[in-house]
Interface confidence: low
């Protein structure tokens, strides 16, 4: 594992002005077709903002509204997906913030419909008419090779019939495919004969076989999934995690951080702390304290969750999940708000740290 040189009360040395967004993978905003999407340009002191999509200047039109630091896309379509950037032009310099827009109905297995037509896949059989499993819609199975960008959703379908109604199970690379085999698990929609994997990562590459069987026979079909990934990248942190939390004094709270990385990531939980009554050092950078880091005896699952038990007012503040690999660092932050316990609002707790 690559190790960080971050220790207690060290600083992250951000550039001027400090922002978290330059050093992490771009945020991903997901919308379903037809939905509206609003994104705020996360840059400070933005006097003049210009927008681009996939490197091309983006101007207002009947579906795209640009107001100040906000971009609105009305009635999104898959064509709106891409890499967006807002650039803040200042008198002496300019700064750019990148983000991804993904307009998808979360379908990848050759069917673009909403799957509201499940009846087509459920063929009713006369109970006397015993029949071995058979495919009911081979058109949806023609595309065997699926090359999907990382972080997208993949759906494989094996619509089948038979009497009695066959069961379906899935194999990965010829072996039983278990939920614990991938971060976030997977979904099986039996009524649609489908396997769904969200936020695919390179380790999801491989052959996926549906096995459909009843007492009269068994059929199978194999798809190959290739997760299209650019060259080695910093860890990708799941958008929206960790999430802001609030609890009362004495309560418990947990922050969750989901990390995706080709190279082995090193994960740390950091709290923004005060030193000598100040949150910032003389250089203007924040004081940080490492609360939890991956060690020899720590599993990935354990490090992805930060538990804070018996919360006190001193626990309030900003918490950061920081993940790094051999290529770089990414981090997301969340705030913990601590509320007075009911009926104890007037009680004042003094922390020994602040007593003279």
């Amino acid at each position: 594992r690559p190790s960080f040189s971050l220790v207690e009360d060290t600083t992250l040395e951000p550039e001027e002005p400090p922002t978290k967004y330059q050093i992490s993978q771009p945020e991903v905003y997901v919308a379903a077709p037809g939905e509206s999407l609003e994104v705020r340009c996360l840059l400070k002191d933005a006097a003049v903002i210009s927008w681009t999509k996939d490197g091309v200047h983006l101007g207002p039109n009947n579906r795209t509204v640009l107001i100040g630091e906000y971009l609105q896309i009305k009635g999104a379509t898959p064509r709106d997906s891409g890499l967006y950037a807002c650039t803040a032009s200042r008198t002496v310099d300019s700064e750019t913030w990148y983000f991804m827009v993904n307009v998808t109905d979360a379908i990848s297995s050759g069917d673009d419909e909403d799957d509201t037509d499940g009846a087509e896949d459920f063929v009713s059989e006369n109970s006397n008419n015993k029949r071995a499993p058979y495919w009911t819609n081979t058109e949806k199975m023609e595309k065997r090779l699926h090359a999907v960008p990382a972080a997208n959703t993949v759906k494989f379908r094996c619509p089948a019939g038979g009497n009695p109604m066959p069961t379906m199970r899935w194999l990965k690379n010829g072996k039983e495919f278990k939920q614990e085999h991938r971060i976030g698990g997977y979904k099986v929609r039996n009524q649609h004969w489908s396997l769904i994997m969200e936020s695919v990562v390179p380790s999801d590459k491989g052959n996926y076989t549906c096995v459909v069987e009843n007492e009269y026979g068994s059929i199978n079909h194999t798809y190959h999934l290739d997760v299209v990934e650019r060259s080695p990248h910093r860890p990708i942190l799941q958008a929206g995690l960790p999430a802001n939390a609030s609890t009362v004094v004495g309560g418990d709270v947990e922050f969750v951080c989901k990390v995706y990385s080709d190279a082995q990531p090193h994960i740390q939980w950091i709290k923004h702390v005060e030193k000598n009554g100040s949150k910032y050092g003389p250089d203007g950078l924040p004081y940080l304290k490492v609360l939890k880091a991956a060690g020899v005896n720590t599993t990935d699952k354990e490090i992805e969750v930060l538990y804070i038990r018996n919360v006190t007012f001193e626990d309030a503040g900003e918490y950061t999940c920081l993940a790094g690999n051999s290529i770089g660092i990414s981090f997301h932050s969340a705030w913990l708000t601590v509320l007075p316990a009911p009926g104890r609002e007037k009680e004042i707790t003094a922390s020994p740290d602040y007593l003279e």
Epitope: P2, E229, S231, H233, G324, S326, G328
Partner: antibody
Framework: EVQLLESGGGLVQPGGSLRLSCAAS????????MHWVRQAPGKGLEWVAV????????YYADSVKGRFTISRDNSKNTLYLQMNSLRAEDTAVYYC???????????WGQGTLVTVSS | QSVLTQPPSASGTPGQRVTISCSGS????????VNWYQQLPGTAPKLLIY???NRPSGVPDRFSGSKSGTSASLAISGLRSEDEADYYC???????????FGGGTKLTVLG
């Protein structure tokens, strides 16, 4: 504005040593993977080495393994390439390049010329 | 001998469309993104295309990239005299644990 400024190039005899530096500014150096890429006169580009943001991971091209060492000093925003046992075929312009979150080798310095000759 | 193979030269007249190919293997282009760089005479290389087909901000849309299997290509439409330069493809190679470049293609704009 991102700036990368290489220095330390010059004439050295075969078997000699040289240390190149790359001074970085205009971005968060301590968060960026950094590369050295070289170009022999009239030839194409050849990747030399990469170092992770914190210096913990390093990769080298086979042609320089065991002879070159990439390092960095994040407190000085400086990248280094220590070149030992230099050969004539190491003669090239050496560029340092920054890897940005979305791109690889997004920013390049202007290069420093290393000449290995007796 | 470069790991990625490019034609040494290409040419076209102003306004024409020119395509430069880059051939590799499954361990580099096949499994990873491919980038394209433009190097004008006497200057440092400049990123032109990343991830096979994406253009950084500021790169004209006359430049486009594509990838199929273990090969990639760079297309330049509406050729201009200022496009005369050396063009390099590059990709991470899983088996070498490092970056590999093509040998470069010298583009000449005729007339």
């Amino acid at each position: 504005e991102v700036q990368l400024l290489e220095s330390g190039g010059g004439l050295v005899q075969p078997g000699g040593s040289l240390r190149l530096s790359c001074a970085a500014s205009g971005f968060t150096f301590s968060h960026s993977g950094m590369h050295w890429v070289r170009q022999a006169p009239g030839k194409g580009l050849e990747w030399v080495a990469v170092i992770s943001y914190d210096g913990s991971n390093k990769y080298y091209a086979d042609s320089v393994k065991g002879r070159f060492t990439i390092s960095r000093d994040n407190s000085k925003n400086t990248l280094y390439l220590q070149m030992n046992s230099l050969r004539a075929e190491d003669t090239a312009v050496y560029y340092c390049a920054r890897e940005a979150p979305l791109y690889d080798f997004e920013y390049w310095g202007q290069g420093t010329l290393v000449t290995v000759s007796s | 001998q470069s790991v990625l193979t490019q034609p040494p030269s290409a040419s076209g007249t102003p306004g024409q469309r020119v395509t430069i190919s880059c051939s590799g293997s499954s361990s580099n282009i096949g499994d990873n993104g491919v980038n394209w760089y433009q190097q004008l005479p006497g200057t440092a290389p400049k990123l032109l295309i990343y991830g096979a087909s994406n253009r950084p901000s500021g790169v004209p849309d006359r430049f486009s990239g594509s990838k199929s299997g273990t090969s990639a290509s760079l297309a330049i439409s509406g050729l201009r005299s200022e496009d005369e330069a050396d063009y390099y493809c590059a990709a991470w190679d899983d088996s070498l644990d490092g970056w590999v470049f093509g040998g470069g293609t010298k583009l000449t704009v005729l007339g």
